[in-house]
């Protein structure tokens, strides 16, 4: 997260880190005791999932292996549409005040809605500085029409944009797959943005979760 702030401890109990060994690979969101939602471009063969801590590499955090993941069947590495994936944990999480599932959306929030995005991604760009603490940024949803002025044909119909006019605050590498939460519901998964990160008036781009609720529910049901 560029130009963000340290999240209030324990305020994001659904936030997970997908680790490759001990290294951050991507963010993710707990949606069920067995399931984590993340970005399809975060796919690996297997994952170490850290839950229940705002500190990356926290020894006291729950760590659960995951060996199965299900990309959206329409995901394209070419056009990066449908950048959404479910990761099935090998064992269920122990829910607590520090570990909770996020609420999936009942509807799509409109432009102008205030949201918070979080992650352990780099706080500087292009040179990288990875924080140990979970970082947050407060952003507002931007209409597709406005966002298309910046990204033109790269912006797909199920992509969502968020940012703050004239501000550098934004997501960056390492934040991928993490949550954009608006009015206590998951509205976006961090997908992509302009590089170097933090260029004012270049919004962050997210997968619009409200458009995928049926796929999420059906995939969890099929593979339970």
């Amino acid at each position: 997260i560029i130009d963000g702030y340290k999240c209030k401890e324990g305020s994001h109990p659904w936030q997970v880190a997908l680790l490759k060994g001990n290294q951050l690979h991507c963010g993710g969101v707990l949606v069920d005791k067995y399931w984590v939602l993340t970005a399809a471009h975060c796919k690996m063969g297997q994952y170490q999932v850290q839950l229940g801590s705002d500190k990356i590499g926290d020894q006291s955090a729950q760590k659960i292996k995951a060996t199965k993941s299900f990309r959206h069947p329409g995901y394209s590495t070419k056009t990066h549409v449908n950048d959404i994936m479910l990761v099935r944990l090998d064992e269920p999480v122990k829910m607590s005040s520090k570990v909770e599932a996020v609420q999936l959306p009942e509807h799509c929030e409109p432009p102008g809605t205030s949201c918070t995005v979080s992650g352990w991604g780099t706080t500087t760009s292009p040179d990288v500085t990875f924080p140990s603490d979970l970082m947050c940024s407060d952003v507002k949803l931007i209409s597709s029409r406005e966002c298309k002025k910046v990204y033109k044909d790269l912006l797909g119909k199920t992509m969502l944009c968020a940012g703050i006019p004239d501000s550098k605050t934004n997501t960056c590498n390492g934040d991928s797959g993490g949550p954009l939460v608006c009015n206590d519901t998951l509205q976006g998964l961090v997908s992509w943005g302009t590089y170097p990160c933090g260029q004012p008036n270049d919004p962050g781009v997210y997968t619009q979760v409200c458009k995928y609720k049926r796929w999420v529910m059906e995939t969890m049901k099929t593979h339970r």
Epitope: H41, M44, Y195, V205
Partner: antibody, heavy 128, light 108 residues
């Protein structure tokens, strides 16, 4: 600072497979969102993009070479490799590896990149 | 594929001259154009990216301009070290990246 070094046989027989490796030093190949790129230059000619790979393993190839090219990455060795099968004399060239700086990060990091750091190049001759 | 046409293919100039090289794309590439300098037996070196952004460490006598289909590289005052071949590269289409045929700047 970041350096790239190509290595591999300088002579390959027609119909065989050309194999080259690029070793990255002074930085990690896992530093997303960079693209790791192969480019070639036949003697006295211009530059041709062969393809690229992200540290995640996603590959992008020149359609004109796609059926013969494989690019792979080994993050543990900080290397990426090129294999070009069924070579002919037309594949004789200086082969360069390079780092591609993208315009976007994340899911779109393979889009729109230019090369800021290049290896010195290695000459590969295809001859029997 | 997007074709890149560079002109001239050879350019004879003297030290101190202002030199302009043109690159045309067969379709619009917005500002996604880079310029490279290559000396004999050496790898290309990045000079300009995003049509007009100067790469760090590159002398300010090099400048780039243009957008859409027409681009130029200008050397405001040619120095002895600038005699080389220059290539443009378009990176404004998803695949493949393509280069111009090159412009050789030689001593008059």
């Amino acid at each position: 600072q970041l350096q790239l070094q190509e290595s591999g046989p300088g002579l390959v027989k027609p119909s065989e497979t050309l194999s080259l490796t690029c070793t990255v030093s002074g930085g990690s190949i896992s530093s997303s969102p960079y693209n790791w790129v192969w480019i070639r230059q036949p003697p006295g000619k211009g530059l041709e993009w062969i393809g690229s790979i992200l540290h995640s393993g996603s590959t992008y190839y020149n359609p004109s070479l796609k059926s013969r090219v494989t690019i792979s990455v080994d993050t543990s060795k900080n290397q990426f490799s090129l294999k070009l099968s069924s070579v002919t004399a037309a594949d004789t060239a200086v082969y360069y590896c390079a780092r591609g700086v993208p315009t976007y990060w994340g899911a779109a990091s393979h889009y729109y990149y230019y090369m800021d750091v290049w290896g010195k190049g290695t000459t590969v001759t295809v001859s029997s | 594929d997007i074709q890149m046409t560079q002109s001239p293919s050879t350019l004879s100039a003297s030290v101190g001259d202002r030199v302009t090289i043109t690159c045309r794309a067969s379709q619009s590439i917005s500002s996604w154009l880079a310029w490279y300098q290559q000396k004999p037996g050496k790898a290309p070196k990045l000079l300009i990216y995003k049509a007009s952004s100067l790469e760090s460490g590159v002398p300010s006598r090099f400048s780039g301009s243009g957008s859409g289909t027409e681009f130029t590289l200008t050397i405001s005052s040619l120095q002895p070290d600038d005699f080389a071949t220059y290539y443009c590269e378009q990176y404004g289409s998803e695949s493949p990246l393509t280069f111009g045929g090159g412009t050789k700047v030689e001593i008059k």
